[in-house]
């Protein structure tokens, strides 16, 4: 004869465990139903009655099958430095990520506790390592023959143009200025630069942030601008 299907609540066989989506209630000493995501246990089971579940109250959630007496509170609303990438619903917590131009300076178990603005490299300095979701921009001084004339969290040092006749020599923060004859471009290591006419600038692609598997941010604590590091500037 096939074994009878037990309906919750039921006493488990000695040494056996409760089935999937059930839990063992120590007080009732019975296997009882868990509540589905988006719900919580309003009334715990007894020997004769199963768990009574209820929907999560506004701004609370449960993500898993559970028997908690109260749903978890969603995180605070996203701050102005953040973007809500996942809304608070009965089944999931709110997720806030740092908005473009910011990175997560202080992570927590799930999400981010603190967003901070990406460092901007000042003229004479370029981006050595681009910012990611969880790391700041690293600036470096422009090497001889290169320059950056911007205050930017994305611009790298670019090679000076090479002039047939130099009007003003370039430096770390300024391109060379040629007289009216056509300039040529210097060769950057590992890259080919075709000669450019005076009237056009070469197009430089911006470094793109590396992909990051860091957890998304949830909270932002108030924070002023970070002190500028060498070669960087605040907003």
């Amino acid at each position: 004869l096939p074994a009878q299907v037990a309906f919750t609540p039921y006493a488990p066989e000695p040494g056996s465990t409760c089935r999937l989506r059930e839990y063992y209630d120590q007080t009732a000493q019975m296997c009882c139903s868990k509540c589905s995501p988006g719900q919580h246990a309003k009334v715990f089971c007894t020997k004769t009655s199963d768990t009574v579940c209820d929907s999560c109250e506004d701004s609370t959630y449960t993500q898993l099958w559970n028997w908690v007496p109260e749903c978890l509170s969603c995180g605070s609303r996203c701050s102005s430095d953040q973007v809500e990438t996942q809304a608070c619903t009965r089944e999931q917590n709110r997720i806030c990520t740092c908005r473009p131009g910011w990175y997560c300076a202080l992570s927590k178990q799930e999400g981010c506790r603190l967003c901070a603005p990406l460092r901007k490299c000042r003229p004479g300095f370029g981006v050595a390592r681009p910012g990611t979701e969880t790391s700041d921009v690293v600036c470096k001084p422009c090497a001889p023959g290169t320059f950056s004339n911007t205050t930017s969290s994305t611009d790298i040092c670019r090679p000076h143009q090479i002039c047939n006749v130099v009007a003003i020599p370039g430096n770390a923060s300024m391109d060379a200025v040629c007289t009216s004859t056509s300039p040529t471009r210097s060769m950057a290591p590992g890259a080919v630069h075709l000669p450019q006419p005076v009237s056009t600038r070469s197009q430089h692609t911006q470094p793109t942030p590396e992909p990051s598997t860091a957890p998304s941010t949830s909270f932002l604590l108030p924070m002023g601008p970070s002190p500028p590091a060498e070669g960087s500037t605040g907003d």
Epitope: S55, D58, S59, S73, C74, S76, R77, A87, C88, T89, R90, R94
Partner: antibody, heavy 120, light 108 residues
Framework: QVQLVQSGSELKKPGASVKVSCKAS????????MHWVRQAPGQGLEWMGR????????KHDPKFQDKAVLSSDTSVSTAYLQISSLKAEDTAVYYC?????????????WGQGTLVTVSS | DIQMTQSPSSLSASVGDRVTITCTAS???????LHWYQQKPGSSPKLWIY???NLPSGVPSRFSGSGSGTDFTLTISSLQPEDFATYYC?????????FGQGTKVEIK
């Protein structure tokens, strides 16, 4: 844009009932609550109850439990407040207001209000 | 029920004054669940500060909110003519959700 448009003013006799409507537009009714708040002449705001239009679940201030019936019809994006056994002290402006799920009850949009006058 | 008591009930102030309104809850309220509304005569209330200290778009930065537990404040750093109105605090921490009795800010 988000709008809550309420039905017009009502003049009722004591003992009668009134049904006030609140038509929502410009947003999805799914993840919001619709609240009803009343304001007697020259008085403050008094929360009466709220409804989850998606499920029909309601919550009341116990003071209004037997007096106010909240309902909604999602097909026409409208919430309703029905007040029974009207008395002179029920004379007030009745507001509907929405709060999005997850916003901790902050009522970010309000209807223009419906004046209900109870007088014999 | 959580009682919300505002003080003062009304105040007279001049343009440019710093104004502080307090709201005291009869039991602790999580800061996420404390909101303020502004209402002008003949108009519907407007959400003015949410979750204790956050300003919805369109609310001037001279307004600020703070507090925790049972004591919360709304501050106007420099009162402007358009700020004369009644302000209500509101708790959504525990049902039934309740409002303070209101604070009317009038022109001196």
């Amino acid at each position: 844009q988000v709008q809550l448009v309420q039905s017009g003013s009502e003049l009722k006799k004591p003992g009668a009932s009134v049904k006030v409507s609140c038509k929502a537009s410009g947003f999805n009714n799914k993840d919001i609550y619709m609240h009803w708040v009343r304001q007697a002449p020259g008085q403050g705001l008094e929360w009466m109850g709220r409804i989850d239009p998606a499920t029909g679940n309601t919550k009341h201030d116990p003071k209004f439990q037997d007096k106010a019936v909240l309902s909604s019809d999602t097909s026409v994006s409208t919430a309703y407040l029905q007040i029974s056994s009207l008395k002179a002290e029920d004379t007030a402006v009745y507001y509907c207001a929405r709060s999005p799920y997850g916003d901790f009850g902050a009522m970010d949009y309000w209807g223009q209000g419906t004046l209900v006058t109870v007088s014999s | 029920d959580i009682q919300m008591t505002q003080s003062p009930s009304s105040l007279s102030a001049s343009v440019g004054d710093r104004v502080t309104i307090t709201c005291t809850a009869s039991s602790s309220v999580s800061s996420n669940y404390l909101h303020w509304y502004q209402q002008k005569p003949g108009s519907s209330p407007k959400l003015w500060i949410y979750s204790t200290s956050n300003l919805p778009s369109g609310v001037p930065s001279r307004f600020s909110g703070s507090g925790s537990g049972t004591d919360f404040t709304l501050t106007i750093s420099s009162l402007q003519p358009e700020d004369f109105a009644t302000y209500y605090c509101h708790q959504y921490h525990r049902s039934p959700w309740t409002f303070g009795q209101g604070t009317k800010v009038e022109i001196k």
